[in-house]
C-alpha cells in the first residue's frame, strides 16, 4: 500500500532486555526513518503476548494511557512532538512481568510497524560459603557448603579442589516468589590430610560481571597422630643432655602430653617438659623405650621410641644428640 519505491521505515529495539526484580527497566523502542523518507506517527502501542488489550498507548491527541498507570511511563513521547521514540519504563519489576512485549508504531503512509522484545526479570543472588566441620567418618560426608540465595535464574555453582571429592547440588524456592536458592555441598572422605586445606566455590550468574569465588578452609577433627623425634641412634655416655620431642598433629589441638616408659614411670635421668623429654647425661649404658601419650578432645594416641646410650667416645663433644 505505500507508494512504490518507498524506502521502508524500521522499528529498532533489542531482542532481549534484562531487568532486576523490584527495580525499574526501560524497554527501548525507536522508529528509524531513512534519510529521504517521511512518515507520520499517530499512535504508539505496547502490548504483551498472551494478554488481552494493550498495556500502554500514546495517542497523538489523547496522550498516554496505561493499563497500570503507577507502573508504566513513556520515557520520551510527548504531545506535540514527533512520535519516534516509544521507549517504555516499567517500575517495580515483578517475576510475572517476564515475557514477550510488542512495540508498535501506527504510521502514515507506511502502515503499522512493530517489533518484539523479550523482557527477562533477573534477581541477583547473595552468595555464602562455609565449612562443614567433620570427624573421621570413613565415608563421604559434606565438608563445605556453598549457598546462592534468591537468584533468578538459578545461579550455577561449581567447585575447584585438589583434594578429590564430588559436589551435591540442590535447588529450593527463594524467599521472593520466582527466585531460587541453590545449595551445593562438597563431599569427600575426611582425613587428617584434608584438615586446613581449602576448596573454592565458584558461583556464576547473568547478573555478575565475573564469577564469584568463595574459598573455604576445611576442618576435619581427628585424634592425635603421634611420632617422637630427636634421636639419631648415636647417643653415648658422657655426652651433654639431649631432647626428645613428641610431635603430634591433631584437631583440636592436644590438651596434654604424658611421657612414660614401657617399664612404667620415667627414670630419674628423663624429665618431661610438655611435648619435650629432657634426657640428662648418664654414666652407664641404657636401653629404654619411651612412650609419649598425647590427648585431645577426640581421644589419646601414643608413640614409642627405644633409646640406646652406648659406651665409647662421643663423636662430637657437644652432646648426645645433634639436635
Amino acid at each position: 500500500w505505500p507508494p512504490p519505491g518507498t524506502g521502508d521505515i524500521i522499528v529498532q529495539a533489542p531482542t532481549q532486555v534484562p531487568g532486576f526484580l523490584g527495580d525499574s527497566v526501560t524497554l527501548p523502542c525507536y522508529l528509524q526513518v531513512p534519510g529521504m523518507e517521511e512518515t507520520h506517527v499517530s499512535q504508539l502501542t505496547w502490548s504483551r503476548h498472551g494478554e488481552s488489550g494493550s498495556m500502554a498507548v500514546f495517542h497523538q491527541t489523547q496522550g498516554p494511557n496505561y493499563s497500570e498507570p503507577k507502573r508504566l511511563e513513556f520515557v520520551a513521547a510527548r504531545l506535540g512532538t514527533e512520535l519516534r521514540d516509544a521507549s517504555l519504563r516499567m517500575f517495580g519489576l515483578r517475576v510475572e512481568d517476564e515475557g514477550n512485549y510488542t512495540c508498535l508504531f501506527v504510521t502514515f503512509p507506511q502502515g503499522s510497524r512493530s517489533v518484539d522484545i523479550w523482557l527477562r526479570v533477573l534477581a541477583k543472588p547473595q552468595n555464602t560459603a562455609e565449612v562443614q566441620k567433620v570427624q573421621l567418618t570413613g565415608k563421604p560426608v559434606p565438608v563445605a557448603r556453598c549457598v546462592s540465595t534468591g537468584g533468578r535464574p538459578p545461579a550455577h555453582i561449581t567447585w575447584h579442589s585438589d583434594l578429590g571429592g564430588m559436589p551435591n547440588t540442590s535447588q529450593a524456592p527463594g524467599f521472593l516468589s520466582g527466585t531460587v536458592t541453590v545449595t551445593s555441598l562438597w563431599i569427600l572422605v575426611p582425613s587428617s590430610q584434608v584438615d586446613g586445606k581449602s576448596v573454592t566455590c565458584k558461583v556464576e550468574h547473568e547478573s555478575f560481571e565475573k564469577p564469584q569465588l568463595l574459598t573455604v578452609n576445611l576442618t576435619v577433627y581427628y585424634p592425635p597422630e603421634v611420632s617422637i623425634s630427636g634421636y639419631d641412634n648415636n647417643w653415648y655416655l658422657s655426652q651433654n643432655e639431649a631432647t626428645l620431642t613428641c610431635d603430634a598433629r591433631s584437631n583440636p589441638e592436644p590438651t596434654g602430653y604424658n611421657w612414660s616408659t614401657t617399664m612404667g614411670p620415667l627414670p630419674p635421668f628423663a624429665v618431661a617438659q610438655g611435648a619435650q623429654l629432657l634426657i640428662r647425661p648418664v654414666d652407664k649404658p641404657i636401653n629404654t623405650t619411651f612412650i609419649c601419650n598425647v590427648t585431645n578432645a577426640l581421644g589419646a594416641r601414643q608413640a614409642e621410641l627405644t633409646v640406646q646410650v652406648k659406651e665409647g667416645p662421643p663423636s662430637e663433644p657437644s652432646g648426645m644428640s645433634s639436635n
Epitope: S42, S54, H59, Q60, F108
Partner: antibody, heavy 116, light 107 residues
Framework: EVQLQQSGPELVKPGASVKISCKTS????????MHWVKQSHGKSLEWIGG????????SYNQRFKGKATLTVDKSSSTAYMELRSLTSEDSAVYYC?????????WGQGTTLTVST | DIVMTQSPKFMSTSVGDRVSVTCKAS??????VAWYQQKPGQSPKALIY???YRYSGVPDRFTGSGSGTDFTLTISNVQSEDLAEYFC?????????FGGGTKLEIK
Amino acid sequence: EVQLQQSGPELVKPGASVKISCKTSGYTFTEYTMHWVKQSHGKSLEWIGGIHPNNGDTSYNQRFKGKATLTVDKSSSTAYMELRSLTSEDSAVYYCARWTGDFDYWGQGTTLTVST
Amino acid sequence: DIVMTQSPKFMSTSVGDRVSVTCKASQNVGTNVAWYQQKPGQSPKALIYSASYRYSGVPDRFTGSGSGTDFTLTISNVQSEDLAEYFCQQYNSYPYTFGGGTKLEIK
C-alpha cells in the same frame, strides 16, 4: 475547536467528475493526515485513502485507485478529493476525517448523487 | 483485506440495560481497533481507540475490550441518547476496514 467543513451536496451525471473539499480549522493542518471515507446509503463505511498535508504522501485503498485522487492546499488548510468516471455506484455520502490512527474528527459529510 | 464481522446487526434494548456489540477480525489486528457512534443524520464520532481506551469526553458507560481477533464494545446503563449505529474499525493494516455496523434501538 477542531472543525472539518465539507462542501455541499453534488448532483452529477454518469461519466463526469467531481471535487469535494474539506476545509479545516482549530488545529495545525500539516500535523495530521486527512483521510476520506465513503458511506453508501444504508451501508457501512469504506476507507478510500489518506494524504499527509505536509509532503503530499498518499495511501489509497486499492479499490479506489484510479477512482479517487487526494490533494491538499496548505495555504487554505483544505483537503480535496476528486472522483472521476462516476457511476451510480459512486452515489454515497463522503466524509473527510482527521487521522490519529483512528479517526478522531469527521466532516459533516458530502452527499454525492450520480444520476441522469 | 481484513474483514471485520460485526454482530448483531440490530439490537433493541431499554434504558438502564447493558448491551454488548462484538467485532471479529479475519486476522490478528493486535489492539488497533476503534469504535464509532453514528447518530441518525450525523457523521461518525470516535468513542474508543486502541481497542479499550476512551476518548476524552466519552462517558465511562462505554467500554472497549479485546485484542487479536475478538473485540467488544459494551454500553452499561444504556441512555436514550445512545440511540445510534455503532461501527468497529481496524487500523492495523491497509486497507483500513470497518465492521458492518450495529443499530441500537431504544424500546
